[in-house]
């Protein structure tokens, strides 16, 4: 197993959270395998057992303390281990110096909804969650509607440059329900990545008026 | 482009020491995990050991642990590799390598993206 193909991929969500995700071609799924957590400057450390999400990959949530507490800062390293049980004895499988706001994932936005709807528009508004102060308004946005006959892949992304917690779709067609997503990114960190993408809000833009276009 | 070279392997005796050289030019290594492997006559190449940027993570493979030492000197962009007890099995060629950029060091080749040359290795009995 040790010569399959193996990665080890770690992202902090710029609070209290880092996830990993351990993949290895070859490994045994009952394989007993942790992620410990040893900070260059601070007191703590932290671990967290690795559970299967794939025929080959294993993932885990350090939890750093409370959601909305900032346990990490840009002069942060964290020198991260994947430990496998091999017999009575942890093996190390894979160590990196992890620096956090250099490889940033936030939660996905939270709290969608529609603020004003229209025949041919709808106005919604999101909040990110967990994100750290130190950001500032140094975050972008993408979103995309999904309309009726398309699937997500198909929808053309809009890109918010800026931090800005809503959107005014246009353009839409009146009496037609529609769904909506939200992602978003720092504009920090080499290895930044963006968020995953928001659960989806469903609307219905409001019928066009008997007679009249509006 | 990184350029790796490794240097310092040669003959030994069984029991004895060799320390291995990996200088890096063409890029800074400082923020880069790196790791040792070794080819044997006939055999695949294999993980020897790995070591953080920073120096504070290493791991090695079970048939050196205790007696391969893996460190690092980021202001001279150079990696070691101290052999000691040196067996006959240890006989190969000794390669470092720099792990994909912002990437852990782990123990398969696929996770390295720069190689050096190699350095032969020969321990008689």
């Known amino acids: 197993a040790v010569n399959g193909t193996s990665q080890f991929t770690c992202f902090y969500n710029s609070r209290a959270n880092i996830s990993c995700v351990w993949s290895q071609d070859g490994a045994l799924q009952d394989t007993s395998c942790q992620v410990h957590a040893w900070p260059d400057r601070r007191r703590w450390n932290q671990t967290c057992e690795l559970l299967p999400v794939s025929q080959a990959s294993w993932a885990c949530n350090l939890i750093l303390g409370a959601p909305d507490s900032q346990k990490l800062t840009t002069v942060d390293i964290v020198t991260l281990r994947v430990l496998c049980r091999e017999g009575v004895r942890w093996r190390v499988m894979a160590i990196q110096d992890f620096k956090p706001f250099e490889n940033l994932r936030l939660m996905a936005p939270i709290s969608l909804q529609v603020v004003h709807v229209e025949t041919h528009r709808c106005n919604i508004s999101w909040e990110i969650s967990q994100a750290s102060h130190y950001f500032e308004r140094h975050l972008e946005f993408e979103a995309r509607t999904l309309s009726p006959g398309h699937t997500w892949e198909e929808a053309p992304l809009l890109t918010l440059k800026q931090k800005q917690e809503w959107i005014c779709l246009e353009t839409l067609t009146p009496d037609t329900q529609y769904e909506f997503q939200v992602r978003v990114k720092p504009l920090q960190g080499e290895f930044t990545t963006w968020s995953p993408w928001s659960q989806p809000l469903a609307f219905r833009t409001k019928p066009a008026a008997l007679g009249k276009d509006t | 482009e990184v350029q790796l070279v490794e240097s310092g392997g040669g003959l030994v005796q069984a029991g004895g020491s060799l320390r291995l050289s990996c200088a890096a030019s063409?890029?800074?290594?400082?923020?880069?995990?790196m790791g040792w492997f070794r080819q044997a006559p006939g055999k695949e190449r294999e993980f020897v050991a790995a070591?953080?940027?920073?120096?504070?993570?290493?791991m090695y493979a079970e048939s050196v642990e205790g007696r391969f030492a893996v460190s690092r000197e980021n202001a001279k962009n150079t990696v070691y590799l101290q052999m000691n007890s040196l067996k006959p099995e240890d006989t190969a060629i000794y390669y470092c390598?720099?792990?994909?950029?912002?990437?852990?060091?782990?123990?398969?080749?696929?996770?390295?993206?720069?190689w050096g040359q190699g350095t032969q290795v020969t321990v008689s009995s």
């Open positions: 390598a720099a792990a994909r950029r912002g990437r852990a060091a782990v123990r398969s080749e696929g996770g390295y993206d720069f």
């Open positions: 063409g890029r800074s290594l400082s923020t880069t995990e």
């Open positions: 070591i953080t940027w920073s120096g504070r993570g290493t």
